[in-house]
């Protein structure tokens, strides 16, 4: 589709006649009548295949003909066109002398005309006007004329229709040949496919407008190339979706289970070393002067009362010292000076001679002990605590600290391993004599029956076109990961499939 | 040779939600070449275009009724579905799900056969 | 919001020419397409990007556009191209429907 343009610049008839050279009267009223047909090397009469257009009057004998393309069109004439523009034309321009008002063919008298000219040739669609004047006896026509394409419409004939759009079925300008020029941030065929953001993943990104990337399940970060970890995964990472893959120090399925106490929370106290014994569990082993479960106990040398035969126990930085009662040295006091004739035992402690009178013993009656009977009896001393509990004077009474596992007056009762429930997923505990047992059910291993060994959803290889497939351990579900060009939840389909299926 | 067929509830209240899911049959509603959009007639009246998706679930909707509508896009079933809240009885309509050529300067080439929906009490 | 404009119905003798027009401001800049839709039936596409027949649709159907009308045009119409006709655009990411023209063989 487009448009002949025929401008008509100067029209000379010096003399004002007709083409017979009959005089016009009073002057010759001058309209034009165009014809544009195909190409004929002999241009004839017949049907203006191309079309045809008349303007009106134009000016008397000689005139020069104005431009009038912004006041109504005229000159230039337009002869469109709906086809593609062949290369070639026929071209006949007529004066004609307008007696009257009405110009009509009809209504003219054939002796009417002025002069006819004819020309044909080859014109290529383009901006530029071609210049031409023809001459005949009495008169001179001077005028230029083109092909352009009507809007929309590009290529060397004008047959290709283009028209620019920026909406969701294409983001485009169109070139001078008819081809899409894609505008900025987008391209494909129709231009209609984003241009994503700068470092987009390839397969794990896409984009629905440009700079843009929204990640696929499984992937997240600015540019799409961080995997999401296994939900509820609490110190692990991964390194394709769903996985967690633990951090040092920890274990389980997500990753929660604390297989590092002694580093990850430091309970033991004033210097003591910390050995971790399990998840959640630990040992420490206290320095000298230091007691409790978690060493947090400062303990007095004297507490132990080393100072014999009456000596009293003063503490020391560096341990301790017994002040012994007359008669006795050594140091705890043990060694003694005196003899049975010394009255030495107390609280009704009876005296025995030994080693010829060098020496003597005290026999104690219940509730008193010493080498002189100067203690009431520590009934810790018979370490009554059992399982290693440890045993603590209370005044009159006494009683034991149990360690983690036992509990009971003596620290003789062992605490069930199995009343925190620890075996996961169902499983059934078992107390040991050192520790507890679990039974799982299918599907289940491990100490705590937390390894999952259900049936891998990947194991009958649901995904296609070599996309990577992982399991949800928690779903018992796979999730397929698509290498670039394919979508899907199995990556069954091809991205951008041609317009026509072969279906 | 693609087919489209519309199904959901023939009858819904006023005030509730209309849902209508679009199943795509002979061809990948995961290609980059189509849009899939839905249209609606009332009784006796024109055609209004009510939206479109694209497989990456971009969204196009008509501004009139923008507020309402919602397009979304199950590429793993090959299905696209229309919601459509607070309904009233101007929202009864034969609705159809049609398929968007880019080929075809966005031309609709495919068309469901329409489910007629009824709003009223 | 963008409008297209259809006469409401147009009447044609067997074998004559129809002509329907659609109306819209710089229609001639956008894609104009026409639908054909028959009691009881689905729309069926017969003129995509103003002037381009989709294969199976026959010859008599053509199309224009330019200016602000784009113009559906029947020549030899038959009983069978009775119907309901409407143009379509693109209006930025909006599609807009013509009202649509009801054709009559007479």
């Known amino acids: 589709s487009g448009v002949f343009q025929l401008q008509l610049q100067e029209f000379i008839n010096e003399r004002g006649v007709l083409a017979s050279g009959r005089p016009c009267e009073p002057g010759c009223r001058t309209f034009f009548r165009v014809c544009l047909k195909h190409f004929q090397a002999v241009v004839s009469p017949g049907p203006c295949t191309f079309g045809t257009v008349s303007t009106p009057v134009l000016g008397t004998n000689s005139f020069a003909v104005r431009d009038d393309s912004s006041g109504g069109g005229r000159n230039p004439l337009q002869l469109p066109f709906n086809f593609t523009w062949p290369g070639t034309f026929s071209l006949i321009i007529e004066a004609w002398h307008a007696p009257g008002d009405d110009l009509r063919p009809e209504a003219l008298p054939p002796d009417a005309l002025i002069s006819k000219i004819a020309i044909q040739g080859s014109l290529a669609v383009g901006q530029n006007w071609l210049l031409d004047e023809q001459t005949s006896t009495l008169t001179r026509l001077r005028y230029s004329y083109r092909v352009i394409c009507s809007d929309n419409y590009y290529g060397d004939n004008c047959s290709r229709l283009c028209k620019k759009r920026n909406d969701h079925f294409g983001h485009y300008v169109c070139q001078p040949d008819g081809n899409l020029s894609c505008l900025p941030g987008w391209t494909g065929e129709y231009c209609q496919q984003p241009i994503c953001l700068s470092g987009c993943h390839e397969q794990n990104g896409y984009c629905s407008k440009p700079a843009e990337c929204l990640c696929r399940p499984g992937w997240q970060g600015r540019l799409c190339n961080e995997c999401i970890p296994h939900n509820g995964c609490r110190h692990g990472t991964c390194s394709t979706p769903w996985q967690c893959t633990c951090d040092e120090g920890w274990g389980g399925l997500f990753c929660d289970q604390d297989l590092n106490y002694c580093t990850h929370h430091s309970p033991c106290k004033n210097g003591a070393t910390c050995s971790n014994s399990g998840q959640r569990s630990y040992t420490c082993t206290c320095r000298p002067g230091y007691t409790g479960v978690d060493c947090e106990l400062e303990l007095s040398e004297c507490d132990s009362n080393p100072c014999r035969n009456g000596g009293s126990c003063k503490d020391q930085e560096d341990g301790y010292h017994c002040l012994c009662p007359p008669g006795y040295y050594g140091l705890h006091c043990e060694h003694s000076t005196l003899s049975c004739a010394d009255s030495p035992c107390f609280n009704g402690g009876s005296c025995r001679e030994r080693n010829q009178g060098a020496n003597y013993a005290c026999e104690c009656p219940p509730n008193f002990t010493g080498s002189n009977c100067e203690k009431k009896v520590d009934r810790c001393t018979s370490n009554p605590c059992a399982n290693g509990g440890q045993c603590l004077n209370r005044g009159p009474s006494r009683m034991c600290r149990c360690r983690p596992g036992f509990t009971g007056t003596y620290c003789e009762l062992h605490v069930s391993d199995c009343a925190r429930n620890p075996c996961a997923h169902g499983g059934t505990c078992h107390d040991l004599e050192n520790g507890l047992m679990c039974t799982c059910p299918a599907g289940f291993s491990g100490r705590r029956c937390e390894v999952r060994t259900s049936i891998d959803a990947c194991a009958s290889s649901p995904c296609f076109n070599r996309a990577t497939c992982y399991t949800d351990l928690s779903t018992d579900t796979f999730v397929c990961n698509c290498p670039y060009g394919f979508v899907g939840s199995r990556c069954e389909f091809p991205v951008g499939l041609p317009p026509s299926f072969p279906w | 040779e693609v087919q489209l067929q519309e199904s959901g509830p023939g009858l819904v209240k006023p005030s509730e939600t209309l849902s209508l899911t679009c199943t795509v049959s002979?061809?990948?509603?995961?290609?980059?070449?189509?849009?899939w959009g839905w249209i609606r007639q009332p009784p006796g009246k024109g055609l209004e275009w009510i939206g479109d998706?694209?497989?990456?679930?971009?969204?196009y909707y008509n501004p009139s009724l923008k507020s309402r509508v919602t397009i979304s896009v199950d590429t793993s079933k090959n299905q696209f579905s229309l919601k459509l809240s607070s309904v009233t009885a101007a929202d009864t309509a034969v609705y159809y799900c049609a398929r968007y050529d880019v080929s075809l300067g966005g031309s609709s080439d495919h068309w469901g056969q329409g489910t007629l929906v009824t709003v009223s009490s | 919001s963008y409008e297209l404009t259809q006469p409401p119905s147009v009447s044609v003798s067997p074998g004559q020419t129809a002509s329907i027009t659609c109306s819209g401001q710089r229609l001639g800049d956008k894609y104009a397409s026409w639908y054909q839709q028959k009691p009881g039936q689905s729309p069926v596409l017969v003129i995509y990007e103003d002037s381009k027949r989709p294969s199976g649709i026959p010859e008599r159907f053509s199309g224009s556009n330019s200016g602000d009308t784009a113009t559906l045009t029947i020549s030899g119409t038959q009983p069978m191209d009775e119907a309901d006709y409407y143009c379509?655009?693109?209006?930025?990411?909006?599609?807009?429907f013509g009202y649509g023209t009801k054709v009559t063989v007479l």
């Open positions: 002979g061809g990948s509603i995961s290609s980059s070449s189509y849009y």
């Open positions: 998706i694209y497989y990456t679930g971009s969204t």
């Open positions: 379509q655009a693109w209006d930025r990411d909006t599609g807009v």
